[in-house]
Interface confidence: low
């Protein structure tokens, strides 16, 4: 007997062919011998089966000797043996309908688990293999689980169900809710305006929730909440903001924060959390601020940085177009009795300049100028 696999909710077409290429009498029945459909002359007739409103045939193929049974919006319980009776012969087709669904929702937070559950007819013993968008294969029986979802798991998961050497393919679109970047770092000179951006790695029609930015300044003993906000249908409204610093927030996505001035006391690390409506758990993005200051006090030219810098970063002081006078893997460098000219303070990583501040040293009889 021929085996056909179908997908829950889909349409299947079971074929039945006569040797004569003309419209002749046929019937389709189920295993209980209940008539599903057939013909009476050139008209389609339907029997009392449960499939009544979902069963059809391709009337226009009858005169080619083809008498298909089409079952729309397949259900697991449609799994059965279907018998086509035509020209005093019987053709049997076993239909097995499978369904594959994601545990709760197809929109999951980064770090959460995805469980795929296979619905299958009694007596079947299918195997399932799923391939994630990043090419990772997982195998299982009735359930498959993937823990710790990552951003790269967003996209179409392709799952193949195998039964009786036949296969049926399911595609499930999974959206991993996360920020585009887990962490970002902003380098600024003292006094400059700071822009923090928190782009999301997904798009949904309606996005509602609430968020908060906690800040741990390098100089402070504890962290504090800088701003709290609400998100309603992608519109941002500020609920509460500290007086110092007085952050400003954009009204539209992506989430965007502006710090009017980069000051040493603000240098440090922040954690933006976003709790989405109807989701357990929160999205997180870390943001870091590094602030540089170059100063000349009497005969001492100093360059300092505050904030989370890695030990491999190099801080240098150099006279323009000359070799570095001082270069250290430290957060402060200085030069005593600097000669007159334009001095550059550079924070660099493997030769790549991350931050630069210029200070003009005048001959000793005048005061320094900071451009």
């Amino acid at each position: 007997k021929k085996v056909v696999l179908g997908k829950k909710g889909d349409t299947v077409e079971l074929t039945c062919t006569a040797s004569q290429k003309k419209s002749i009498q046929f019937h389709w029945k189920n295993s209980n011998q209940i008539k599903i459909l057939g013909n009476q002359g050139s008209f389609l007739t339907k029997g009392p089966s449960k499939l009544n409103d979902r069963a059809d045939s391709r009337r226009s193929l009858w005169d080619q000797g083809n008498f298909p049974l089409i079952i729309k919006n397949l259900k697991i319980e449609d799994s059965d043996t279907y018998i086509c009776e035509v020209e005093d012969q019987k053709e049997e087709v076993q239909l097995l309908v499978f369904g594959l669904t994601a545990n709760s929702d197809t929109h999951l937070l980064q770090g959460q688990s995805l469980t795929l559950t296979l619905e299958s007819p009694p007596g079947s013993s299918p195997s399932v293999q799923c391939r994630s968008p990043r090419g990772k294969n997982i195998q299982g029986g009735k359930t498959l689980s993937v823990s710790q979802l990552e951003l790269q798991d967003s996209g179409t998961w392709t799952c193949t169900v195998l039964q009786n050497q036949k296969k049926v393919e399911f595609k499930i679109d999974i959206v991993v809710l996360a920020f585009q970047k887990a962490s970002s770092i902003v380098y600024k000179k003292e006094g400059e305006q700071v822009e923090f951006s928190f782009p999301l790695a997904f798009t949904v029609e309606k996005l509602t929730g609430s968020g908060e930015l906690w800040w741990q300044a390098e100089r402070a003993s504890s962290s504090k909440s800088w701003i709290t906000f609400d998100l309603k249908n992608k519109e941002v409204s500020v609920k509460r903001v500290t007086q110092d610093p007085k952050l400003q927030m954009g009204k539209k996505l992506p989430l965007h924060l502006t710090l009017p001035q980069a000051l040493p006391q603000y240098a440090g690390s922040g954690n933006l959390t976003l709790a989405l409506e109807a989701k357990t758990g929160k999205l997180h993005q870390e943001v870091n601020l590094v602030v540089m200051r170059a100063t000349q006090l009497q005969k001492n030219l100093t360059c300092e940085v505050w904030g989370p810098t890695s030990p491999k970063l190099m801080l240098s002081l150099k006279l323009e177009n000359k070799e570095a006078k001082v270069s250290k893997r430290e957060k402060a460098v200085w030069v005593l009795n600097p000669e007159a000219g334009m001095w550059q303070c550079l924070l660099s990583d493997s030769g790549q300049v991350l931050l630069e501040s210029n200070i003009k040293v005048l001959p000793t009889w005048s005061t320094p100028v900071q451009p």
């Epitope: 889909d10 077409e13 050139s42 008209f43 059809d56 009337r59 226009s60 193929l61 005169d63 080619q64």
Partner: antibody, heavy 119, light 107 residues
Framework: EVQLLESGGGLVQPGGSLRLSCAAS????????MHWVRQAPGKGLEWVAV????????YYADSVKGRFTISRDNSKNTLYLQMNSLRAEDTAVYYC????????????WGQGTLVTVSS | DIQMTQSPSSLSASVGDRVTITCQAS??????LNWYQQKPGKAPKLLIY???NLQSGVPSRFSGSGSGTDFTLTISSLQPEDFATYYC?????????FGQGTRLEIK
């Protein structure tokens, strides 16, 4: 959104060959019977060929039988029409169309691709 | 093959008019009759399937009726966007065949 996008049309000499493609998106391509329908300049619509959802059955209009071959690649969501021994009377805009219900009800159509057979 | 004959072959009407186009099949086709609308340079669009069923997204001013050999497409109140060519098509017997079309023009 359902989209059918034909390509491969152009100018060809009588007796020449051409292969048309129709890229489908926005629906379960592998559940639909797919057709080619053509329209000669300033004329009506003429059905050309049909292929079953799984590619197991093909039917052709008498005017193209033996010269045209319809095929599909469900893994690429693409329908094809290989046209050989082309004649001047094959000059037309060729449309691909999907058919989910009873055979011959074209619920979605592509924008068409023009095939001109001329020396 | 089943022959499909539409009438009239062209028709002039004004916005707001009620318009009827008929289609006759050369043999009984039950209710396996579809109607399409085609605008210049565009692909046809399915309006009505199986004689009287309105395709999703099609305005309710379009309606279809008939069974056997005689069928009608009615537009209850013509809108500017309805000026186009209309085709009937049978899907009862192989091969599917179309009527020659009815061109609906602005009066």
């Amino acid at each position: 959104e359902v989209q059918l996008l034909e390509s491969g049309g152009g100018l060809v000499q009588p007796g020449g060959s051409l292969r048309l493609s129709c890229a489908a998106s926005g629906f379960t391509f592998s559940s639909y019977w797919m057709h080619w329908v053509r329209q000669a300049p300033g004329k009506g619509l003429e059905w050309v060929a049909v292929i079953s959802y799984d590619g197991s059955k093909e039917y052709y209009a008498d005017s193209v039988k033996g010269r045209f071959t319809i095929s599909r690649d469900n893994s690429k969501n693409t329908l094809y029409l290989q046209m050989n021994s082309l004649r001047a009377e094959d000059t037309a805009v060729y449309y691909c169309a999907s058919d989910y219900g009873d055979y011959g009800t074209y619920d979605y159509w592509g924008q068409g691709t023009l095939v001109t057979v001329s020396s | 093959d089943i022959q499909m004959t539409q009438s009239p072959s062209s028709l002039s009407a004004s916005v707001g008019d009620r318009v009827t186009i008929t289609c006759q099949a050369s043999q009984d086709i039950s209710n396996y009759l579809n109607w399409y609308q085609q605008k210049p340079g565009k692909a046809p669009k399915l309006l009505i399937y199986k004689a009287s069923n309105l395709q999703s997204g099609v305005p309710s001013r379009f309606s279809g009726s008939g069974s056997g050999t005689d069928f009608t497409l009615t537009i209850s109140s013509l809108q500017p966007e309805d000026f186009a060519t209309y085709y009937c098509q049978q899907s009862y017997n192989f091969p599917a065949t179309f009527g020659q079309g009815t061109r609906l023009e602005i009066k």
